[in-house]
């Protein structure tokens, strides 16, 4: 299953399959997730080791048993790959690292006014993988405001150095934020020239294209079909690059197919997995296990659940079958692709779905209406769980926020439905940033069921929580995916990085905002919060957040939206915007429904008809 916990001051011994430099443990974990063999990783921050060569070292590891012995190492961080973790799987990494220079091949230098502008340039440059920016206070005046665009053979820095007044980060192309745009066309009977960066075997050009998309240096590809004239080259997928970023030439060639990486697509990237099943095809590789199962779909599920399994073949040969069950061969290889592909067999083959974003149909559970005051504009895909709950009567207007917690579930505040319990009048917009982008043609979700907490009473602050079941499940994308829920009764975690988001008023007597606003707000203990509300009881089912001096808060229209906190690189839904005394007033924290206290209720209500939980805890 999905294991998200990180181990501080621990290092996994042995099992090394690759090593690289990464700026933090979260990026190391992401590289492990996308590495075909990596199950575990260990990361050495700069502070944890004197050896300059091992600083920022990210060590990817495999283990037949799925675990390795941990040794104590001060400062080290270890953890698991996020394979099998559904919507948490993403190659998108937005963080900017201050005081760090990520080294690589510098291929472009320009003057820019901010690190965000530098990141944008990298994202809009086809070859840029990461960048470094020298701030206005950099010690050498001639380098100040320099934006260096970089790449490397592996897509990760060739070295990382601590350097004052330098900020570094990665391209946001994997976040589907590139302005370049992409070529979706597949070119039949055409071969591209230029430099081969890798060679793998794939059953078709679509798998080849997805592998190219997620390969750090692949910009385009050529695939040789299973009837290509040279037998040894059949099903070969050649991943390619060039100096210019486009093929310098193409040759008409029977039984070849070419195309481009989809990494530069805007708003939508292919999933990093291959769900198609190939009848009459055998995939060869190292045998992991053989099991008897009923049907090829069950074989694929078995492969997906066995974390080391990369691909499978389901044999229908009479000697491989017993009654209704046949042999399911679970296999793996060094690069994650079959070592041999054979056609015209009595088998069916396919890939593990361990890297599919959708995962199973689960949710990740790891007094006055309120809004965002003192916030700033959000950017695309920054808060992909945020939804807008809108009511259409004569006109249509935004009323509340909400959080996507599963394909078919939104969590919000019960008070959003005070006086408006009719599900037909509501429209739920997900994957949006600007309310002005909504037109009559913008797709929206309708409500199948509104589940208000049984102890909620209108105009009271207690039990202000409601679930919305959508009429149809939503697909996950970089801009529309769920937030993890906390563990039940999560009281021990100390959250220090919390944000509230919404389109609500930007001042107490204001109006709904067009661009989704965000504000970083510290949590306040319930004891402190209680002292500031002389008339209302702050229960253990509430959590408070706010600044002593005020100025930043949620406001009218933010109700029902998320209070999320980042812990160990993972965002969790800690609170639901509920109520407060005005907005952003001095010494009056916002009050939020504490999600951890309602986990039993959430899990009970989201049980599907077959009794399978629709959400799961990250822990």
């Amino acid at each position: 299953g999905c294991l998200t916990q990180l181990y501080e001051n621990a290092f996994f011994r042995g099992g090394d399959v690759a090593s690289m430099y990464t700026p933090n443990a979260q990026y190391c974990q992401m590289r492990c997730t996308f590495h075909p063999r990596c199950l575990l990783f260990s990361f050495l921050p700069a502070s944890s080791i004197n050896d300059m060569e091992k600083r920022f070292g990210c060590f990817l590891k495999d283990s037949v048993t799925g675990t390795l012995p941990k040794v104590h190492r001060t400062g080290a961080v270890s953890g698991h790959s996020l394979k099998q973790c559904g919507h948490q799987i993403s190659a998108c990494h937005r963080d900017i690292y201050k005081g760090v220079d990520m080294r690589g091949v510098n291929f472009n230098v320009s003057k820019v006014s901010s690190v965000e502008e530098c990141q944008k340039r990298c994202t809009s440059n086809i070859r840029c993988q990461f960048f470094s920016y020298a701030t206005q206070t950099f010690h050498k005046a001639e380098y100040r405001n320099n934006c260096l665009l970089k790449y490397s053979p592996g897509g990760t820095p060739t070295a990382i150095k601590v350097l004052s007044n330098v900020e570094s980060g990665f391209s946001l192309k994997p976040c589907a934020l590139s302005e370049i745009g992409c070529h979706m066309n597949i070119f039949q009977h055409l071969a591209f020239s230029d430099v081969d960066v890798a060679r793998v075997l794939t059953p078709d050009a679509f798998v080849c294209r997805t592998i190219c998309t997620y390969h750090p240096n692949c910009l385009f590809f050529t695939f040789y079909t299973n009837v290509w004239k040279i037998e040894s080259q059949r099903n070969v997928c050649l991943l390619k690059t060039s100096e210019s970023g486009t093929p310098s030439s193409s040759t008409p060639q029977e039984n070849t197919i070419s195309g481009y990486s989809l990494l530069t697509c805007k708003r939508t990237l292919p999933e990093p997995c291959h769900s198609k099943i190939y009848p009459g095809v055998d995939f060869g590789g190292e045998e992991l296990n053989v099991t008897f199962v009923k049907g090829v779909n069950v074989c694929q599920e078995t492969c997906t659940k066995m974390i080391r399994c990369q691909f499978f073949t389901y044999s229908l040969l009479p000697e491989d079958c017993k009654e209704e069950k046949c042999k399911c061969f679970l296999r793996l290889s060094m690069d994650g692709s079959p070592t041999r592909i054979a056609y015209g067999t009595q088998g069916s083959s396919g890939y593990s779905l361990r890297l599919c974003n959708t995962g199973d149909n689960s949710v990740c559970t790891t007094k006055t209406s309120t809004r965002i005051v003192g916030g700033t504009n959000s950017s695309w895909g920054e808060w992909p769980w945020q939804v807008s709950l809108q009511v259409k009567l004569t006109a249509q207007r935004h009323l509340c926020g909400g959080s996507l917690i599963g394909h078919q579930w939104v969590l919000t505040a019960a008070h959003c439905f005070d006086g408006l319990p009719l599900q037909d009048v509501w429209r739920i917009y997900s994957g949006i940033l600007n309310l002005s982008d909504i037109t009559k043609d913008t797709p929206f979700s309708q409500i199948k069921e509104i589940i208000i907490h049984q102890n909620y009473k209108v105009s009271e602050g207690n039990h202000d929580i409601a679930l919305i079941k959508l009429q149809a499940p939503l697909n996950y994308t970089e801009f529309q995916k769920p937030i993890c829920l906390p563990s039940k009764g999560d009281t021990s975690t100390i959250y220090t990085n919390c944000w509230v988001t919404g389109w609500g008023f930007s001042k107490e007597k204001g109006e709904i905002q067009n661009i989704l606003q965000k504000v970083n707000i510290p949590l306040v203990t319930n004891e402190e919060c209680q002292k500031r509300y002389q008339d209302y009881k702050i229960t253990q089912r509430m959590v408070c957040a706010g600044y002593k001096e005020g100025g930043k808060d949620a406001c009218k229209g933010d109700s029902g939206g998320p209070l999320v906190c980042k812990h160990n690189g993972m965002w969790r839904l800690v609170g639901i915007t509920s109520w407060g005394e005005g907005c952003a007033r001095r010494e009056q924290p916002g009050v939020y429904t504490k999600v951890a206290e309602y986990m039993d209720w959430i899990l009970e209500k989201t049980q599907s008809s077959d009794g399978k939980a629709q959400m799961q805890s990250p822990a």
Epitope: K457, Q530, K531, Q534, D535, Y536, K537, I538, T539
Partner: antibody, heavy 116, light 106 residues
Framework: EVQLQQSGAELVKPGASVRLSCTAS????????IFWVKQRPKQGLEWIGR????????KYDPKIQGKATLTADTSSNTAYLQLSSLTSEDSAIYYC?????????WGQGTLVSVSA | DIQMTQSPSAMSASVGDRVTITCEAS??????IAWYQQKPGKAPKLLIY???TLQSGVPSRFSGSGSGTEFTLTISNLQPEDFATYYC????????FGQGTKVEIK
């Protein structure tokens, strides 16, 4: 309208016990805290304790030392103050009050007279 | 335990006067002080909380100030209905009242 109705005056003998009630209307006591405050004749106010009727969690003034016991019955929306081993020092008006961080709304008070 | 020392214990004033009552805490109470007014035979009434926040419905002639351990209640234009006893209350650590200040007609 928020109201706290306290029980009537009590005349009790030294060493005896007494139970005072505070019945709420206009709100549910589970949604608030109930506080008790003592005021001796011609003297100031003293906080006795606080109960959270939702879970019966209580806090007392450390000086009370078992003199007072706070309880609540959510079905009747009533809070109680039990005073034991009464002495003349316990003769006072006892107020119940509701609130969050402090006492926002008060009952009318109950006079307890301890006399042989 | 936090002690609250209120002064004066009694004072005489006339309608229209500016009246100041002080409360000193034995420790820093982080501005968690409230002021109550009590009239004979009646329950106390909350006037001000968190040093200076006026409870709704309380006239604006009442104001509170202070920080750390020194706090003040001011009635800027004393009205006939303001003759009463005033109590401070610290609620930073449990609850402690001051001894009270009786404001009488001169």
């Amino acid at each position: 309208e928020v109201q706290l109705q306290q029980s009537g005056a009590e005349l009790v003998k030294p060493g005896a016990s007494v139970r005072l009630s505070c019945t709420a209307s206009g709100f549910n006591i589970k949604d608030t805290y109930i506080f008790w405050v003592k005021q001796r004749p011609k003297q100031g106010l003293e906080w006795i304790g606080r109960i959270d009727p939702e879970n019966d969690n209580t806090k007392y003034d450390p000086k009370i030392q078992g003199k007072a016991t706070l309880t609540a019955d959510t079905s009747s929306n009533t809070a109680y103050l039990q005073l034991s081993s009464l002495t003349s020092e316990d003769s006072a008006i006892y107020y119940c009050a509701k609130g969050g961080g402090l006492f926002a709304y008060w009952g009318q008070g109950t006079l307890v007279s301890v006399s042989a | 335990d936090i002690q609250m020392t209120q002064s004066p214990s009694a004072m005489s004033a006339s309608v229209g006067d500016r009246v100041t009552i002080t409360c000193e805490a034995s420790h820093d109470i982080n501005n968690y002080i409230a002021w109550y007014q009590q009239k004979p035979g009646k329950a106390p009434k909350l006037l001000i909380y968190y040093t200076s926040t006026l409870q709704s419905g309380v006239p604006s002639r009442f104001s509170g100030s202070g920080s750390g351990t020194e706090f003040t209640l001011t009635i800027s234009n004393l009205q006939p209905e303001d003759f009463a006893t005033y109590y401070c209350l610290q609620y930073d650590n449990l609850f402690t009242f001051g001894q009270g200040t009786k404001v009488e007609i001169k």
